[in-house]
Interface confidence: low
């Protein structure tokens, strides 16, 4: 039996059709196609809601870039 076979895996079957303001986003994680039917990005909002988004959409890519820069910038 593979390691962590019982670890929950999250997949996306549908994507949000609404652009989410980057100010409402706290983090994201990528979902790879080997585990799921579709490649996806799951954004976690500041109220801890998880939302599936299409990584091919420009706003999704821009939001990921923004969050990446946020994590690289040390908080004062």
């Amino acid at each position: 039996q593979p390691d962590a076979i019982n670890a929950p895996v999250t997949c996306c079957y549908n994507f949000t059709n609404r652009k989410i303001s980057v100010q409402r986003l706290a983090s994201y994680r990528r979902i790879t196609s080997s585990k799921c039917p579709k490649e996806a990005v799951i954004f976690k909002t500041i109220v801890a809601k998880e939302i599936c988004a299409d990584p091919k959409q420009k706003w999704v890519q821009d939001s990921m870039d923004h969050l990446d820069k946020q994590t690289q910038t040390p908080k004062t």
Partner: nanobody
């Protein structure tokens, strides 16, 4: 808690067929969308097919489309994977999984897994 037990695996020649079964016990089976995954030696677990709990909608990985068919029998608490035109690259341990709650935006978490059944396709 849901218990899932797979069966139907075995050794088959390329081009042959197998039908896998996944029997569920525990909570109401019809409350769950059901999925098949597979894991080949040294490789990552891979999505194969899914069937919804409500309308029987099905989803397939590109690698199995047209060859594999997922179905379910809620009266028997069982989900099936009919595998035709098998190829050596289909060799793997096949696992069924029960989907937990899904979010409005389509995120799905797999809460329960079976122990797996070995499928070996020889050339």
């Amino acid at each position: 808690e849901v218990q899932l037990v797979e069966s139907g695996g075995g050794l088959v020649q390329a081009g042959g067929s197998l039908r896998l079964s996944c029997a569920a016990s525990g909570r109401t089976f019809s409350n769950y969308a059901m999925d098949w995954f597979r894991q080949a030696p040294g490789k990552e677990r891979e999505f194969v097919a899914a069937i919804s709990k409500s309308d029987g909608s099905t989803y397939y990985a590109d690698s199995v489309k047209g060859r594999f068919t997922i179905s379910r029998d809620n009266a028997k608490n069982t989900v099936y994977l009919q595998m035709n035109s098998l190829k050596p690259e289909d060799t793997a341990v096949y696992y069924c999984a029960a989907e937990g709650d899904s979010s409005p935006m389509g995120g799905v978490t797999y809460d329960y897994w079976g122990q797996g059944t070995q499928v070996t396709v020889s050339s």
